[in-house]
Amino acid sequence: WELTILHTNDVHSRLEQTSEDSSKCVNASRCMGGVARLFTKVQQIRRAEPNVLLLDAGDQYQGTIWFTVYKGAEVAHFMNALRYDAMALGNHEFDNGVEGLIEPLLKEAKFPILSANIKAKGPLASQISGLYLPYKVLPVGDEVVGIVGYTSKETPFLSNPGTNLVFEDEITALQPEVDKLKTLNVNKIIALGHSGFEMDKLIAQKVRGVDVVVGGHSNTFLYTGNPPSKEVPAGKYPFIVTSDDGRKVPVVQAYAFGKYLGYLKIEFDERGNVISSHGNPILLNSSIPEDPSIKADINKWRIKLDNYSTQELGKTIVYLDGSSQSCRFRECNMGNLICDAMINNNLRHTDEMFWNHVSMCILNGGGIRSPIDERNNGTITWENLAAVLPFGGTFDLVQLKGSTLKKAFEHSVHRYGQSTGEFLQVGGIHVVYDLSRKPGDRVVKLDVLCTKCRVPSYDPLKMDEVYKVILPNFLANGGDGFQMIKDELLRHDSGDQDINVVSTYISKMKVIYPAVEGRIK
């Protein structure tokens, strides 16, 4: 019996088509992805093949102005229109709190939303009961398929799930649910979830009875043969894991941002064994036309976004200096504002011993592309912020050794004075440079804000200690020559849209007046 699994993950509000790097579409003839194009391909496959499932492995939320404005209603509406069969909860689905998940998505979705390792307690338990499920049995043709969901147990550190949701270990939580499916005579089981490729592989290895793993969170691109675009495969598609009980379990992921549609064909025998698995992600490029009815619906929903861009978010009573003359040479108050917003967006009081789980921010000065003048009545709009942060990136959470941070700060000034973008703006860090010294030896003092303390204070950086840092995804991926970050990072979790982080902070503060205060000397 042959099953076709179509899958997406980490779409992050890319409802409209995007350019090849998943930023705003500029030249339509070269654009990719978007729900209208996705629908065309999905329908094509549904017409051609008998047993098809369309699955999403989480993180539909967060990433563009679509989410900022519609807050998840857009996800429910367009996923319903595409007739998704199931979705797993990702960490970003909790970005607007549990209410921001329940009302727009859980109550509106016409498909099951799954996670076996999230357990509700207290007053939330009855409120959320039945709105998401540990698993769902879906009829597909003459057969039935069990889908069991999972979500990163790091979600409390990455988003805002509140105190009434417990995130259990994925493997521990999945096994009893899979066992339950087996007792219901369901012998074809897909684990659909959002914990990253390493955990996907572990689930394939450790959870008895899981036949296929469809994952997300790590934006992993897998491909067999010559890849069709710029993404470099992390392995073959599907990636085969040998389980502890000796079965070959296919593991798949489809990069991110709706650029690809994962396409996996599985042949099962009567016992539910995977006899064969093959496929590849399908690049959703302009050779695939956008579905006219979905496109018309997108255009209708788009109108509200254009209005939002010009509305006031808050006010500044000082000049926000985002000029390259400042931000690439010294501490600039736009850099301070952005870093403060980044830390504020990551406030998570999950442990009594820590005032917060992260205190540090670094930001390449070259990523700040415009100042904001306070003489326009102090008004700050989304449009203004889009000029400052035009690249559509995210502010991510990484774990780095102190020694890696030291290398990063040496790189920051290794060719100081040439107006290059690698000069770092900071938050929760005091750095002193001596530019008379030779490159690679210019950092003379590097103090960092403690986290395991009730009164935050600055302590010298310890080379062997592991620190959490918020930074742009551009830096996490080694941009501006920060190869040491990419090569040496111990953990990387993608975060919220850059503009959204700053806009939320400004809206929250109402009036801002960031200063230059001696973070960089």
């Epitope: 019996w1 003459d142 000796g246 025998d269 009567e270 016992r271 064994n273 995977v274 006899i275 064969s276």
Partner: antibody
């Protein structure tokens, strides 16, 4: 649990036909295939062909083409294999086996003797 | 048709021995290969499917490997109940074809 139950032993004269049945249970019958495999006394296994339960589509091995007919009765989840123009070398145990031979019937002995 | 050449046709071994059986296909069969065990008077039983996946209930001393045209069944430590005849089966293309069988006997 998948189960395949075959009909009993048969003794046939050369030139006659034999029809062996295989009743399946424990799975969604219409979604799969059934294979038929022959094993002559003291010999190895030989694949005869397969039938798709849902629409009756068949694929026969060249060696048996023209003499073998596989049919399906969806209402009783039963598959049949008929072999005609029997000769002594058709004396064998005939097995039905699921799509990828994960489960087998107990075998039906067919003796062709004058 | 794809020919499956199985070797050896028979072997004698003792309990605890490591036993290796090979199947060579006349052309590339991907990993569309099963291994089956048959005891006298009984129907065959599948041990391994898709080259290396172990059927449920089959002891982990059985393992399969290979690719392209060369495939191997290994019994890491032969047990008394393992004395039987073993067959490979390719299902990459019609007609499906079995190897000639390997009879594993007690030394």
């Amino acid at each position: 649990e998948v189960q395949l139950v075959q009909s009993g032993a048969e003794v046939k004269k050369p030139g006659a036909s034999v029809k062996v049945s295989c009743k399946a249970s424990g799975y969604t019958f219409t979604a799969y295939f059934m294979n038929w495999v022959m094993q002559a006394p003291g010999q190895g296994l030989e694949w005869m062909g397969r039938i798709y339960h849902n629409n009756g589509d068949t694929f026969y091995s060249q060696k048996f083409k023209g003499r073998v007919t596989m049919t399906v009765d969806k209402s009783t989840s039963t598959v049949y294999m008929e072999l005609s123009s029997l000769r002594s070398e058709d004396t064998a145990v005939y097995y039905c086996a699921t799509s990828y031979v994960g489960d087998w019937g107990q075998g039906t002995t067919v003796t062709v003797s004058s | 048709d794809i020919q499956m050449t199985q070797s050896p046709s028979s072997l004698s071994a003792s309990v605890g021995d490591r036993v290796t059986i090979t199947c060579r296909a006349s052309q590339d069969i991907g990993d569309s290969l099963n291994w089956l065990q048959q005891k006298p008077g009984k129907a065959p039983k599948r041990l391994i499917y898709a080259t290396s996946s172990l059927d449920s209930g089959v002891p982990s001393r059985f393992s399969g490997s290979g690719s392209g045209t060369e495939y191997t069944l290994t019994i890491s430590s032969l047990q008394p109940e393992d004395f039987a005849t073993y067959y490979c089966l390719q299902y990459a293309s019609f007609p499906w074809t079995f190897g000639g069988g390997t009879k594993v006997e007690i030394k």
